[in-house]
């Protein structure tokens, strides 16, 4: 049978030789998992199954992506007549894609006698371990090297059945059982030396396509028994149609309308409903550095800008904890949003002997550097003596005020004698509630802050008994000259609410590096951004006027259409296959002859690198 397009896929297991329940329970589990299954995504583990188990439901399995483990069973035959490929993406004991052991009962004659894997012709990764199966026959008549792709794979076949019938004479000593229908099909060791994979005959022109796995019926990639990499509508391909293809007119990678996604070893137009798209694959869940988003009705994984959103429960009313303390500080690791409030009380920082809570290590307060939003209030009534600001909250942007402290406060900072500045450099909004900042004897800068700009409604402020404004000015505790009149959270150009001139990554600067400096910049509004790395630095002039590689004054390496590129396209997927270009004398990328398959040094057929396709009498396509 040749590769089909739709197949019943089921999950495998990862239990090893440990199972729960008795043999009957094991059988039911296997039946539920694998009945009508064609592709096992994971491992096929058959362990501790009884002698009367009817395993004929396994007969549809054609492929296992992980390993096959058969151990401590008592049934006589394992019916996997359609199993073609074991991929070995996971292996047992670090090296085995097939692991068969102890399949007999020491107190009875019940035992595994036949492994009828008559179609198994490919193990893509990993070796074979078949040991101590007292009555299992014909394992040493199989040429395992013909099946195993990796020539260094370990093959252990020993201490199995001893008084076994010979192979049928038509099998020439290679068989899975005694019948004429049990012969092993050889698809590798019989091939002509010209074949670099498998073959369907001994002649030099009877090689399978290199994308085939397990053999084939003919030379094309649609003639494969199974695919080495991916099956795209019946053709074996190294990659599924990619999400981006090179557009010859715009000289850019653009969305491919014919994109498909990898689902196991199959290319599919859309992932199953409980999967999401990650780059070009269907996955059960996004990796930890990405988050799930929906775009045009498609669930996709997108890289998080910085940390992925993580919401955590806060402290105070409605929470398990009264204050941040040593018992709960670790629960705030990597949190970007606090659902509720944050309270810092003396019993949290210095410990609470009554509740057997030790003092908090001040270093641990750095966990709050990831917090961008607090939905409730922020209440700081105790702070470590050596910490002179609240810079651990330097990324806090919003205090929601959905729940309020005491008499309606959303931001409360009081009696912190060592604090000299707030350091809340990212705070842009206090959505609701009052601001209460009192009795912080050394605290400066707060008078400069335009609180009204932070509040959605008229700011209700109670700010008193901090260091007097005049005293702060006398001591030079004033905003940096690069700050605007909006004020600042503390000393230096990184603490401004906004900038007088320009800003670079949150720090106020006199000017952007338009025409000098190691790294050149352009401005968007009053924000400085670096030019694209493919722009060449122009001495005494403008290097770029935007962020893209098409906004450079000159290119650092090569130019492909309007875009500066590190190298000219080499095998980038286009609408009609890979695209190759070469750089001309003015470092412009020009198309190779259309018959070049590995790149070129010039526009002519004789300039192709490696083998070219047989010449069609046509001029090169002009791009």
């Amino acid at each position: 049978s040749e590769v089909g397009n739709s197949q019943a896929v089921c999950p495998g297991t990862l239990n090893g030789l440990s199972v729960t329940g008795d043999a009957e329970n094991q059988y039911q589990t296997l039946y539920k998992l694998y009945e009508r299954c064609e592709v096992v995504m994971g491992n096929l583990e058959i362990v501790l199954t009884g002698h009367n188990a009817d395993l004929s439901f396994l007969q549809w399995i054609r492929e296992v992506t992980g390993y096959v483990l058969v151990a401590m069973n008592e049934f006589s035959t394992l019916p996997l007549p359609n199993l073609r490929v074991v991929r070995g993406t996971q292996v047992y004991d670090g090296k085995f894609a097939i692991f068969v052991m102890l399949n007999y009962n020491t107190n009875s004659s019940h035992a595994l006698r036949q492994l009828r894997l008559t179609q198994l012709t490919e193990i893509l990764s990993g070796g074979v371990y078949i040991e101590k199966n007292d009555k299992l026959c014909h394992m040493d008549t199989i040429d395992w090297r013909d099946i195993v792709r990796d020539r260094d794979a370990e093959i252990v076949v020993k201490d199995n059945g001893r008084s076994c019938p010979p192979c049928h004479e038509v099998c020439k000593g290679r068989c899975w059982g005694p019948g004429s229908e049990d012969c092993q099909t050889l698809t590798k060791t019989i091939c002509a030396p010209q074949c670099n994979g498998r073959c369907f005959g001994r002649a030099p022109n009877e090689c399978c396509h290199e994308e085939c796995a397990g053999g084939c019926t003919g030379p094309l990639q649609t003639h494969c028994f199974a695919c080495r990499h991916f099956n795209d509508s019946g053709a074996c391909v190294p990659l599924c149609p990619q999400p981006l293809i090179y557009n010859k007119l715009t000289f850019q990678l653009e969305p491919n309308p014919d994109t498909k996604y990898q689902y196991g070893s199959v290319c599919v137009r859309s992932c199953p409903h409980n999967f999401v798209v990650d780059q070009s694959s269907c996955v059960r869940a996004c990796p930890s550095n990405k988050m799930e988003v929906e775009k045009n009705g498609l669930k996709m994984c997108e890289p998080c800008a910085g940390l992925c959103p993580k919401a955590c429960e806060g402290t105070g009313a409605g929470s398990h904890y009264q204050t941040v303390d040593s018992s709960n500080i670790d629960s705030f690791v990597n949190c970007t949003k606090i659902l509720g409030n944050l309270d810092f009380l003396i019993t949290g920082l210095e410990g609470d002997p009554w509740r057997n809570i030790s003092a908090l290590d001040p270093e641990k307060l750095n966990v709050f550097r990831t917090v961008r939003e607090i939905t409730g209030y922020l209440n700081i009534q105790s702070w470590p003596k050596h910490m002179h600001n609240f810079s651990v909250f330097s990324n806090l942007e919003t205090i929601g005020g959905r729940s309020l402290y005491n008499r309606g406060f959303s931001l409360l900072i009081m009696k912190n004698d060592n604090v000299t500045s707030l350091g809340l450099r990212s705070l842009r909004e206090v959505s609701a509630g009052r601001v209460y900042i009192t009795e912080n004897r050394r605290l400066c800068y707060l008078h400069t802050v335009q609180w009204a700009a932070l509040s959605r409604r008229r700011a209700d402020l109670d700010i008193r008994n901090n260091k007097p404004r005049g005293k702060c000015q006398q001591e030079g505790k004033v905003c940096d000259p690069l700050c605007s009149a909006d004020g600042c959270w503390g000393p230096g150009p990184a603490q401004c609410l906004s900038c007088r001139h320009y800003s670079r990554r949150g720090v106020c600067v006199e000017s952007c590096s338009f025409t000098q400096g190691e790294t050149r910049e352009f401005a968007e509004g009053t924000e400085c951004f670096e030019c694209h790395p493919e722009c060449e630095r122009v001495e005494g002039g403008i290097t770029c006027n935007g962020s893209g590689a098409d906004t450079c004054t000159r290119c650092a390496h090569y130019r492909d259409g309007p875009h500066c590129v590190e190298r000219c396209p080499e095998g980038i997927l286009g609408e009609r296959g890979p695209i190759y270009k070469y750089p001309d004398s003015s470092r412009e990328c020009r198309p190779c002859h259309e018959n070049c398959t590995r790149g070129c040094t010039g526009p002519l057929l004789q300039d192709c690198l490696g083998d070219a396709l047989p010449s069609a009498r046509r001029a090169p396509t002009v791009i």
Partner: nanobody
Amino acid sequence: EVQLVESGGGLVQAGGSLRLSCAASGLTFGSAPMGWYRQAPGKERELVAYISGDERIWYGDSVKGRFTISRDTTKNTLYLQMNSLKPEDTAVYYCVSDVKVRHWGQGTQVTVSS
């Protein structure tokens, strides 16, 4: 993390006895399938004895009737009682556990002199 530590190996006269122990940590010991393998110099590793999670036991042909595998769940320890030892039993003996994945101990040397 699963850890297996073998002990009890040593030098013994032919016909003598040894008892190997394998202290296990990081697994639910009572239901863990476990076993003993051995590897003699220049030879393949071979299965000596195995005990399944439901206490079924298997032995290699060459040790049947001489070796006994057992476990003490209160001590999380697997044992191999080796009697009537022969020079061909000389090998490094390894403990394995097969909970989810296979874990190996570092091995203990048994030398049987004639």
